[in-house]
């Protein structure tokens, strides 16, 4: 089970919204807080350790997941071509 603790949005840049979200999750052993279908979720800890973010299925149904080359996060591409980038910190 997960709950969103903080959600900050910055829409000051044209055509770009930066959102910072923190979630608190109660996860089973071997799991850790992550993102599944664009929602906070408990995921296999190995996914986080190896930075194979797309294995969490972080994008919405119908979106395409693409790892950032430096493994700092992932992008979700909507069918229309719009790209949403998520970086992990």
């Amino acid at each position: 089970t997960c709950e969103i603790v903080t959600l900050d949005r910055d829409s000051s840049q044209p055509r770009r919204t930066i959102a910072r979200q923190t979630a608190r999750c109660a996860c089973r052993k071997g799991q850790i807080a992550g993102t599944t279908r664009a929602r906070p979720a408990c995921v296999d800890a190995r996914i986080i350790k190896t930075k194979q973010w797309c294995d969490m299925l972080p994008c919405l149904e119908g979106e395409g997941c693409d790892l950032l080359i430096n493994r700092s996060g992932w992008t979700c591409t909507q069918p229309g071509g719009r790209i949403k980038t998520t970086t992990v910190s």
Partner: antibody, heavy 122, light 109 residues
Framework: AVTLDESGGGLQTPGGALRLSCKAS????????MGWVRQAPGKGLEWVSA????????SYGSAVKGRATISRDNGQSTLYLQMNSLRAEDTAVYFC???????????????WGHGTEVIVSS | ALTQPSSVSANPGETARITCSGG??????YGWYQQKPSSAPLTVIY???ERPSDIPSRFSGSSSGSTHTLTISGVQAEDEAVYFC??????????????FGAGTTLTVL
């Protein structure tokens, strides 16, 4: 079968520019991250650049950073490498590489092109 | 950088082992690439132990701690080549960037 066919190499002058191409077939090009690896005469393999599936994110080895641009055309199943301000030390065979399982690292290459030779000399 | 021996030799039918160490622990494992003179590299192992379908089963990869090993069981004359290992290096400005070992020449006696 997976095929990666590079072109665009040849004799280049120092300070010049070139664009290498890699035509892919035998797999769904847009589903895989791709990269370029080069090999100077008599030397080992050197990582050059990589690009994610959609083309929105790239990375470069230190030897070419600031002089190279990797791009892709998923509609044409083609990978590109634009190299500017060429130096003698860019002389090498350039190989196109396909990542496995939708991501590419030097540990996950599962297919290579035959290579295209670039010679930078005055 | 990755460290691997410059040369390894084995008699036909014997087992040859090539080791590789170093690089960043990125979780993506190690790759092993065979290259014969005037030819492109050929992937024999990727992601530590996965083998492309057209590679003979005598090629296998394994890891023990920080050492990664390519094992060729029952070496054949056609296995004579240079073998490169591949992994990642990490830098704060570039993140993860691919890196290869200098290559190990396998000689079949």
């Amino acid at each position: 079968a997976v095929t990666l066919d590079e072109s665009g190499g040849g004799l280049q002058t120092p300070g010049g520019a070139l664009r290498l191409s890699c035509k892919a077939s035998g797999f769904t090009f847009s589903s895989y991250q791709m990269g370029w690896v080069r090999q100077a005469p008599g030397k080992g393999l050197e990582w050059v650049s990589a690009i994610n599936k959609g083309g929105s994110d790239t990375s470069y080895g230190s030897a070419v950073k600031g002089r190279a641009t990797i791009s892709r055309d998923n509609g044409q199943s083609t990978l590109y490498l634009q190299m500017n301000s060429l130096r003698a030390e860019d002389t090498a065979v350039y190989f196109c590489a396909k990542g496995s399982a939708s991501y590419i690292t030097a540990a996950t290459i599962d297919a290579w092109g035959h290579g295209t030779e670039v010679i930078v000399s005055s | 950088a990755l460290t691997q021996p410059s040369s390894v030799s084995a008699n036909p039918g014997e087992t040859a082992r090539i080791t590789c160490s170093g690089g960043a622990s990125s979780g993506y494992g190690y790759g092993w690439y065979q290259q014969k003179p005037s030819s492109a590299p050929l992937t024999v192992i990727y992601k530590d132990s996965e083998r492309p379908s057209d590679i003979p089963s005598r090629f296998s990869g394994s890891s023990s701690g920080s050492t990664h090993t390519l094992t060729i069981s029952g070496v054949q004359a056609e296995d004579e080549a240079v073998y490169f290992c591949g992994n990642d290096d990490y830098s704060s400005d570039s993140g993860y960037v691919g890196v290869f070992g200098a290559g190990t020449t396998l000689t079949v006696l």
